[in-house]
Interface confidence: low
């Protein structure tokens, strides 16, 4: 997880993850797991679902426990290296009855000079060197091969590319006399794919290319790419699709205008601009093609790359983003928020919302909150009553369905969600949060109330009475 | 294993006091908001009282104000609901229940302790 | 307060049909998106328990015979097939507001 978390969240929620849908039929959800031999054409994955399903059930006292672990490779091609020169790698998970791969790109924030990259040398060394990588991770979220914990992907081929470049996975330079560090962010991504291909991802049907903060905005940079690069090779069959979790970000004005010193306090746009030029890196060519010589700093950000993008990306984007609010300087520690603060947070949550209006596949919860998709509890957030795993299945079928991606959802399986209400935590389903000095759980009023949240104020906004307002909030809603 | 469990029921005459408890085990206690509810011999579910986690939100069921109050120990994992005034439409079987953070629903029920108000 | 209207009060099913259970709110119990209404099975001599939550999600443990449905004032809870050990009291729940209400219960009986 990423710079100063304001809020600490529980790794699992109270709420059990919704249950487990296998595909279902005509826009239903699938109810039980009885075995449906005439499903069996064209959703292999179903299928073994309910055999897996059906095998579980058969030996629930079985200690053959199938090993859920990712194990790491490191790139034979030993000159695409993170910033130190260590060779760079992923963590693999084969599924062989799977066609489905799932390379998830970590994320960690960046450096963009000297002193911050040396700074997060000293104190993140994981981030920027292989050395000391343990040999096998295991598999959360949507990288999980548990149905329970994974309804969506449980099947496929798991693929972890740790984050060692620092560059938001965009830079293309090596380490030399020249560059104390390399960036090779983009290169790392090629280099796998490339040895994916002799491990099987040459029968692939589909290939997700996913990643939460820095890696989900590497995601919106290199998806047309990877597709680029498997076209190129001989595999134009394999369907490139990309899914960015909290890496939708804003070149919005900061709350309180700061210096460039270090990264959580330096403008994005500040950040992108100086960091573009230190990692010589590298953005999707069609976008770089809109903005003149000196501006690719623009195609960092979702709203301005994503129109440019062949590929059919999914956004998933907290719409209180605690990322976002750190580099904006939203701090929201020790003393209440002004009411400055408060409407500047509530401005974000609009102004994201009107960037997702046109993004075709999005998940956004009106949540305060940073990354889902590999934490266990990204099952339990809905929006609108559809789960995250429901809508990317729903985003799955729309493909299937025709061969380009439909642009209306079948009914009752939507896949652009994104929540309309007005406040952090108005959403019942956000993960829990935490006063960061007590580490107690704190209801919506509470957290409100922290916030220095003005009763009569928000229900004068909300053409409501205070009363009405309150016990809403006193009941946790 | 997640668990509640009620003690303090007893017979008691009318305009008289009592005092229930909820030892809490399994799960912290100090995270979760917590509720009374009770059930009439042969009738349904009614809420009494509800406490947020850190005893900042204390609320009551209209009949029940000025009569009861709900406190509770998070050092002590122990919620308390002291009775007095008390009649014998209050006869029931008491229940606490941890609330579910997200959506106000009572996720995990003690087994009840048994009020009798009367003569 | 919220007045939740149960129905039927009792019910009689065959082993293996459907039961269908309703519950009206007299104000809606839906915000943003969300229903605040959940159901409960309580067992003679038992205390309640969670089926499912916020309309239509099933708790932990629960089977997936059981589902929810519904939204601003009017909610159904389906239980199909029906079971013996289901013959018990169904009680659905709103936590729109401070005071949470119950429906005054329906009685399963199988046949």
């Known amino acids: 997880s990423e710079g100063r978390k304001t809020w600490r969240r529980r790794g699992q929620q109270p709420p059990p993850p919704p249950r487990t849908e296998a595909a279902p039929a005509a826009g239903q959800p699938v109810e039980s797991f009885p075995l449906d031999f005439t499903a069996v054409e064209g959703n292999m994955d179903s299928f073994m679902a309910q055999v897996k399903s059906l095998a579980q059930s058969l030996y629930p006292c079985s200690a053959q426990q199938l090993n859920e672990d990712l194990r790491l490779h490191l790139l034979l091609n030993t000159s695409v290296t993170c910033n130190d020169g260590s060779p760079a790698g992923y963590y693999l998970k084969e599924s062989r009855g799977s066609r489905r791969w799932l390379l998830f790109l970590e994320g960690g924030w960046y450096c963009f000079n000297r002193e911050n990259c040396d700074s997060r040398y000293d104190t993140m060394r994981r981030l920027m060197s292989s050395r000391d990588w343990p040999r096998t991770r295991t598999g959360t979220g949507i990288l999980s091969s548990q149905p329970e914990e994974n309804p969506y992907w449980w099947n496929a081929n798991m693929v972890f590319i740790p984050y060692c470049s620092s560059d938001v996975w965009s830079g293309a330079s090596s380490k030399s006399e020249k560059n104390e560090y390399a960036f090779m962010g983009a290169l790392i991504i090629q280099e796998v794919v490339r040895e994916l291909l002799g491990r099987g991802l040459s029968g692939a049907k589909v290939l997700l290319l996913a990643g939460s903060s820095a890696g989900g905005t590497g995601v919106l940079l290199n998806v047309d790419r990877v597709a680029e690069q498997l076209e190129k090779l001989g595999y134009p069959a394999i369907q490139v699709r990309g899914l960015a979790d909290s890496g939708w970000f804003l070149d919005n004005k900061q709350y309180r205008r700061s210096d460039c010193i270090d990264t959580i306090n330096c403008a994005p746009t500040d950040a992108i601009r100086r960091g573009i030029r230190y990692w010589s890196g590298m953005v999707p060519e069609r976008c770089q093609r809109q903005f003149k010589e000196g501006e690719e700093w623009n195609c960092f950000f979702g709203y301005k790359v994503y129109p440019t993008l062949r590929c059919p990306v999914f956004v998933v984007q907290w719409l209180f983003d605690e990322a976002q609010l750190t580099v904006d300087n939203v701090h929201l520690t020790g003393q209440p928020v002004q009411e400055g603060q408060w409407l500047y947070i509530q401005n974000l949550g609009r102004e994201l919302r009107g960037t997702l209006k046109d993004v075709q596949a999005s998940f956004a919860p009106a949540c305060l909150s940073h990354e889902i998709i590999i934490r266990s509890y990204w099952t339990d957030v809905q929006v609108k009553g559809t789960s995250l795993p429901r809508a990317l299945h729903c985003w799955d079928r729309s493909f299937h369905d025709s061969h380009k991606a439909s642009k209306t959802p079948m009914k009752g399986c939507p896949f652009h969600l994104v929540d309309s209400c007005p406040w952090p935590h108005c959403n019942p389903s956000c993960p829990t949060i935490r006063d960061q000095f007590t580490g107690q759980e704190m209801n919506v009023a509470q957290f409100l109330m922290h916030m220095g949240f003005d009763v009569q104020t928000v229900a004068q906004q909300q053409g409501m009475e205070p009363s009405k307002l309150l016990g809403m909030l006193s009941n946790g809603n | 294993e997640v668990q509640l469990v009620e003690s303090g029921g007893d017979l008691v005459k009318p305009g008289g006091s009592l005092k229930l408890s909820c030892a809490a085990s399994g799960f912290t206690f100090s995270d979760y908001g917590m509720h009374w509810l009770r059930q009439a011999p042969e009738k349904g579910l009614e809420w009494v009282a509800y406490i947020s986690s850190g005893s900042t939100t204390l609320s009551y069921a209209n009949t029940m104000k000025g009569r009861f109050t709900i406190s509770r120990d998070n050092a002590k994992k122990t919620l308390s609901l002291q009775m007095t005034s008390l009649r014998s439409e209050d006869t029931a079987i008491y229940y606490c229940?941890?609330?579910?953070?997200?959506?106000?629903?009572?996720?995990?029920w003690g087994t009840g302790t048994t009020v009798t108000v009367s003569s | 307060d919220i007045v939740l209207t149960q129905s039927p009060a009792s019910l009689v099913v065959s082993l293996g049909q459907r039961a269908t259970i309703s519950c009206r709110a007299s104000?809606?119990?839906?915000?943003?998106?969300?229903?605040?209404m959940h159901w409960y099975q309580q067992k003679p001599g038992q205390p309640p328990k969670l089926l499912i939550y916020l309309a239509s999600n099933l708790e932990s443990g629960v089977p997936a015979r059981f589902s929810g449905s519904g939204s601003g004032t009017d909610f159904t809870l389906n239980i199909h097939p029906v079971e013996e050990g289901d013959a018990t009291t169904y009680y659905c729940q709103h936590s729109r507001v401070l005071p949470p209400t119950f429906g005054s219960g329906t009685k399963l009986e199988i046949k």
């Open positions: 229940a941890r609330k579910n953070y997200n959506g106000g629903y009572f996720d995990v």
């Open positions: 104000k809606s119990v839906s915000e943003s998106g969300y229903s605040y």
